[in-house]
């Protein structure tokens, strides 16, 4: 996160850290807990990496430096990458992770509500992006979970800023015209959440952008509301019944 500040314990209890252990262990992506056994993240997190074996998912944590060999983590039972996702393209950048064992909810580890299917009418004015990613373009993973308040940008405005790319209705953009605050590498897959009527909802999944926090280059996020059918289909077909945290 560029231009962010430290988060507090329990402030974003749905935030998880996706880590890979090959020779060394490292944080690669964020993710959002959406049910006892389900995490929503970005498909591109898995580019070039093996599925299942090497991944460790840490939930209910604030500081990555607190992780030791004794820190409990979840392992992956199944990774479901959107069938239309193509490597090095920004479309359909969404993936579901089914955990091997369900997680108990606590004050520090509980799910984020999902938006309604095709939610286009809600005007979100209080949106935040969180993660342990770089604090500058060529930076390093941060120890303490960072948060930053970023306004949504219309798709029309976003398309003007990305004339070489197609900003689809299944994407949502967020950023300041002057730049300075944004997600960055290592934040991918993490949540863009907005508070509406006193409730936090998962509006976007951190996906891509031209650099980080550049002037007139907003961050681009996968629009979760546009994938509700897919999320429900995949979680129900795997579980037999949905265990998602849907909005009231």
């Amino acid at each position: 996160i560029v231009g962010g500040t430290n988060s507090s314990w329990g402030e974003w209890p749905w935030q998880v850290s996706l880590q890979v252990k090959l020779t060394a262990q490292r944080h690669l992506c964020g993710g959002s807990l959406i049910g006892h056994q389900w995490v929503l993240t970005a498909a591109h997190c898995f580019d070039g990496l093996p599925l299942q074996d090497v991944w460790r998912i840490y939930s209910g944590i604030l500081n990555l430096s607190d992780i030791t060999k004794d820190t409990p983590f979840s392992q992956i039972k199944e990774i479901i990458i959107h069938q239309n996702y193509k490597v090095s393209e920004g479309n359909h950048d969404i993936a579901l992770i089914k955990l091997q064992a369900p997680l108990n909810y606590t004050e520090f580890q509980k799910p984020i509500c999902l938006p309604s299917k095709g939610d286009t009418s809600t005007i979100y004015t209080n949106c935040w992006v969180t993660g342990w990613g770089f604090s500058k373009e060529k930076g390093e993973i941060q120890n303490i979970l960072q948060k930053v308040n970023i306004p949504l940008v219309t798709n029309e405005e976003c398309q003007k800023r990305y004339q070489d790319y197609k900003i689809t209705q299944r994407m949502v953009c967020a950023g300041y015209k002057e730049g300075g605050k944004d997600a960055c590498k290592g934040d991918s897959g993490g949540p863009l959440v907005c508070k509406h009527n006193g409730m936090w909802r998962l509006v976007g999944i951190t996906s891509w952008g031209e650099g980080c926090a550049r002037r007139e280059q907003p961050g681009v996020y996968t629009k979760v509301a546009e994938y509700m059918d897919w999320i429900l289909e995949k979680t129900q077909s795997s579980d037999g019944k949905a265990q998602m945290q849907s909005p009231a």
């Epitope: 890979v20 090959l22 580019d47 070039g48 990496l49 093996p50 599925l51 060529k138």
Partner: antibody
Framework: EVQLLESGGGLVQPGGSLRLSCAAS????????MVWVRQAPGKGLEWVSY????????FYADSVKGRFTISRDNSKNTLYLQMNSLRAEDTAVYYC???????????????WGQGTLVTVSS | QSALTQPPTVSVSPGQTARITCSGN??????VAWYQQKPGQSPMLVIY???KRPSRVSERFSGSNSANTATLSISGTQALDEADYYC?????????FGGGTRLTVL
């Protein structure tokens, strides 16, 4: 210790086919992206192709696209390169390499085989 | 698919610092690796992620990358450093190598 051993090179006529193999040992093969890189005599390194750990995604240089096919058999710890419609300009030493890749840091190859020579000539 | 440009040759006196450049459009936005290749041998990774050095590589090797140019520096150059050096970057699923630089120790 990581070991990569290429085989299958040799002399082939233009338009012919060849299949290269790369036997891997000393690491968990199924965890890593694998790559083929070639070097024409007296020339520099040229990327040919790479393949994801599961084999689910493959990528090719424009110069070989549609003619070469990369594949892997994780149960045999072996990487392959099927080369069809070979041309004189494909003459090179072909190296197999183990790739380190993720979306944050990009791609680099930290272990290389000794290479196998492919000569395309009539 | 952008190209990476290296000088064909660089010469240096023993004990001096050799600097080999690699230039490309917005190269500073990408992470660069460097490989050393001695005659008749396979390439060997000497720098990755712009500045990191594998444990088996001498501390005399260092890297930097900003704007449009990445640089491999070899301090206290020795005769054993004579080799071809290649830069490499990754861009939108494409692996790109520079044309290579022959380092000669005078």
């Amino acid at each position: 210790e990581v070991q990569l051993l290429e085989s299958g090179g040799g002399l082939v006529q233009p338009g012919g086919s060849l299949r290269l193999s790369c036997a891997a040992s000393g690491f968990t093969f199924s965890w890593y992206t694998m790559v083929w890189v070639r070097q024409a005599p007296g020339k520099g390194l040229e990327w040919v192709s790479y393949i994801y750990p599961s084999g689910g995604a493959t990528f090719y240089a424009d110069s070989v696209k549609g003619r070469f096919t990369i594949s892997r058999d994780n149960s045999k710890n072996t990487l392959y390169l099927q080369m069809n419609s070979l041309r004189a300009e494909d003459t090179a030493v072909y190296y197999c390499a183990m790739g380190s890749y993720d979306y944050i840091w990009g791609f680099y190859s930290d272990h290389w085989g000794q290479g196998t020579l492919v000569t395309v000539s009539s | 698919q952008s190209a990476l440009t290296q000088p064909p040759t660089v010469s240096v006196s023993p004990g001096q610092t050799a600097r080999i450049t690699c230039s490309g459009n917005k190269l500073g936005d990408k992470y660069v690796a460097w490989y050393q290749q001695k005659p008749g041998q396979s390439p060997m990774l000497v720098i990755y992620q712009d500045t990191k050095r594998p444990s088996r590589v001498s501390e005399r090797f260092s890297g930097s990358n900003s704007a449009n140019t990445a640089t491999l520096s070899i301090s206290g150059t020795q005769a054993l450093d004579e080799a071809d050096y290649y830069c490499q970057a990754w861009d939108s699923s494409i692996v790109i190598f520079g044309g290579g630089t022959r380092l000669t120790v005078l």
